[in-house]
C-alpha cells in the first residue's frame, strides 16, 4: 500500500495527499480544549483508472459497470487517530482518542 | 454507523449501496474456479454536507475548505472478504480469503 | 512571558462570599481554556473548575458545585472565581492556570481564610 | 471520581542520584496523567503532560512513563533545585484528581 504525497506547489493532478492544518479556535470551537490545531492532512486529485486503488472490489464495479456507478473517488485509504481534551456537553471534560482524525495515505476506491 | 440500502427501483439520490452480482464468467476470467459468480454491491449516489459522513475529518476539511478539496464521496465504508479457489498464475490452485470484495455499507469520506 | 495574577483573596466569615480575580498576560487569553485550583494549609492540589477559551462551557467537582461559578472576560484578560456560602473546609490558597492538555502555566495564589 | 495514589509519600536522596515516583490510577486513563513540582510557598510547576511528553523549558533529565493505570516520573541525574513535592494528576474525565505528592528531601 502507498500513496502519492504533495503539497501547494505540486503540479501532480492524480489523487494525492495534501497537507491541511485543522485550526479549531478557527471553527470557534471553544469546547474543544486541546488541541488547538492539528494537521489533518486531505485527498485531492483525479482516480484514473486502477491508479492508487485499494480494494480489487473497485476495479471490478469498473468492469461490470453498474448503472449510475461512479469512477473511483480520491479519499483517506489510512487513517490515525489523534488525543484530544473537550467538554462533553454534560459538564465534563474528556480525554479521548479520536479515531480517523488525521489522513494518512490517499487512494482511490 | 449506518447507511443506505438501494436497489434499482429506488429513487433515492443520496449516497447508497445498490445490489451488484459479479461475473467473473463473464468477465473472461477463466483462472478464478470459484465462486464463478458473488454479491458485490457497489456505492453510488450523492453526498450533501454531513450526510452519512464517516470519519469526522471529512467534516473538519469541509469546514478549513482548502484549495482544490473536493465534496466528499460516495465510497464504501465497510467491505468483507469473500473466499476464492484460482490459479496464481504459477501452475498452482490457491484457496483463500481475498479482502474487500463485498461491499456491506457504504458512506462519505 | 506567560504571567497570571491572582486577587480578591482575605478573610470570610462562613457562609459568606468571594469573588476572585486573575489578570493574565503573555499570551492571548481569549485562545485558552482557564482552571481554578485550591491548595488547602499543609494539603495537596485540588481542582475547583475549568472554563472553556469563549466562556461557553464550565465544569467543576461535586465539592465546590452550584456554590462557585467560573466565568471570564476575554475584553479584559480576566478570569474569575465567584464563591458562595463559604464554609471552612474552603479555606486555602486558591490558584489560576492556564489549560492545554495540562495546566502548563500557574499564577501565584492567593490565600482564602473562611472562619468566624 | 478516580483516585491517585502517589509512592512513596517522601525520599531522601543525594544529588546525582536517579529518583523515581510512581502513580497508580484506581482505573485506566489511558496518557492522560501529567506531572508536577511545586517548592514551599511557590505555584506548582508542569513538568511533564500527557504521561510522557515534557512541558517546554523542563530539563530533560525528567521523564515520564507509563499508560493506563501505571505511570512513572523519573529524574535521571537529581540537581539541588530539584528538591521539591512532585504530584500527579489526572486528566482523563473530570473530576480531576491529584496524587497525594512525594516530597523529595535531601539525604
Known amino acids: 500500500d502507498f500513496g502519492l504525497d504533495c503539497d501547494e506547489h505540486s503540479t501532480e493532478s492524480r489523487c494525492c495527499r495534501y497537507p491541511l492544518t485543522v485550526d479549531f479556535e478557527a471553527f470557534g470551537w471553544d469546547w474543544i480544549i486541546a488541541p488547538k490545531r492539528y494537521k489533518a492532512n486531505y485527498c485531492s486529485g483525479e482516480c484514473e483508472f486502477v491508479f492508487l486503488q485499494k480494494y480489487p472490489h473497485t476495479h471490478l464495479v469498473h468492469q461490470a459497470n453498474p448503472r449510475g456507478s461512479a469512477g473511483p473517488c480520491c479519499t483517506p485509504t489510512k487513517m490515525s487517530p489523534i488525543n484530544m481534551l473537550y467538554f462533553n456537553g454534560k459538564e465534563q471534560i474528556i480525554y479521548g482518542k479520536i479515531p480517523a482524525m488525521v489522513v494518512d495515505r490517499c487512494g482511490c476506491s | 454507523d449506518f447507511g443506505l440500502d438501494c436497489d434499482e427501483h429506488s429513487t433515492e439520490s443520496r449516497c447508497c449501496r445498490y445490489p451488484l452480482t459479479v461475473d467473473f464468467e463473464a468477465f473472461g476470467w477463466d483462472w478464478i474456479i470459484a465462486p464463478k459468480r458473488y454479491k458485490a454491491n457497489y456505492c453510488s449516489g450523492e453526498c450533501e454536507f454531513v450526510f452519512l459522513q464517516k470519519y469526522p475529518h471529512t467534516h473538519l476539511v469541509h469546514q478549513a475548505n482548502p484549495r482544490g478539496s473536493a465534496g466528499p464521496c460516495c465510497t464504501p465504508t465497510k467491505m468483507s472478504p469473500i473466499n476464492m479457489l484460482y490459479f496464481n498464475g504459477k501452475e498452482q490452485i490457491i484457496y483463500g480469503k481475498i479482502p474487500a470484495m463485498v461491499v456491506d455499507r457504504c458512506g462519505c469520506s | 512571558e506567560v504571567q497570571l495574577l491572582e486577587s480578591g483573596g482575605g478573610l470570610v466569615q462562613p457562609g459568606g462570599s468571594l469573588r476572585l480575580s486573575c489578570a493574565a498576560s503573555?499570551?492571548?487569553?481569549?485562545?485558552?481554556?482557564m482552571s481554578w485550583v485550591r491548595q488547602a494549609p499543609g494539603k495537596g492540589l485540588e481542582w475547583v473548575s475549568t472554563?472553556?477559551?469563549?466562556?461557553?462551557?464550565?465544569s467543576y467537582p461535586d465539592s465546590v458545585k452550584g456554590r462557585f461559578t467560573i466565568s471570564r472576560d476575554n475584553s479584559k484578560n480576566t478570569l474569575y472565581l465567584q464563591m458562595n456560602s463559604l464554609r471552612a473546609e474552603d479555606t486555602a490558597v486558591y490558584y489560576c492556570?492556564?489549560?492545554?492538555?495540562?495546566?502548563?502555566?500557574w499564577g501565584q495564589g492567593t490565600l482564602v481564610t473562611v472562619s468566624s | 471520581d478516580i483516585q491517585m495514589t502517589q509512592s512513596p509519600s517522601s525520599l531522601s536522596a543525594s544529588v546525582g542520584d536517579r529518583v523515581t515516583i510512581t502513580c497508580r490510577a484506581s482505573?485506566?486513563?489511558?496518557?492522560?496523567l501529567n506531572w508536577y513540582q511545586q517548592k514551599p510557598g511557590k505555584a506548582p510547576k508542569l513538568l511533564i503532560y500527557?504521561?510522557?511528553s515534557l512541558q517546554s523549558g523542563v530539563p530533560s533529565r525528567f521523564s515520564g512513563s507509563g499508560s493506563g493505570t501505571d505511570f512513572t516520573l523519573t529524574i535521571s541525574s537529581l540537581q539541588p533545585e530539584d528538591f521539591a513535592t512532585y504530584y500527579c494528576?489526572?486528566?482523563?474525565?473530570?473530576?480531576?484528581?491529584f496524587g497525594g505528592g512525594t516530597k523529595v528531601e535531601i539525604k
Open positions: 494528576q489526572q486528566s482523563y474525565s473530570t473530576p480531576w484528581t
Open positions: 492556570a492556564k489549560q492545554d492538555y495540562a495546566m502548563n502555566y
Open positions: 500527557a504521561a510522557s
Open positions: 503573555g499570551f492571548t487569553f481569549s485562545s485558552y481554556a
Open positions: 482505573q485506566s486513563i489511558s496518557t492522560a
Open positions: 472554563i472553556s477559551s469563549g466562556g461557553s462551557y464550565t
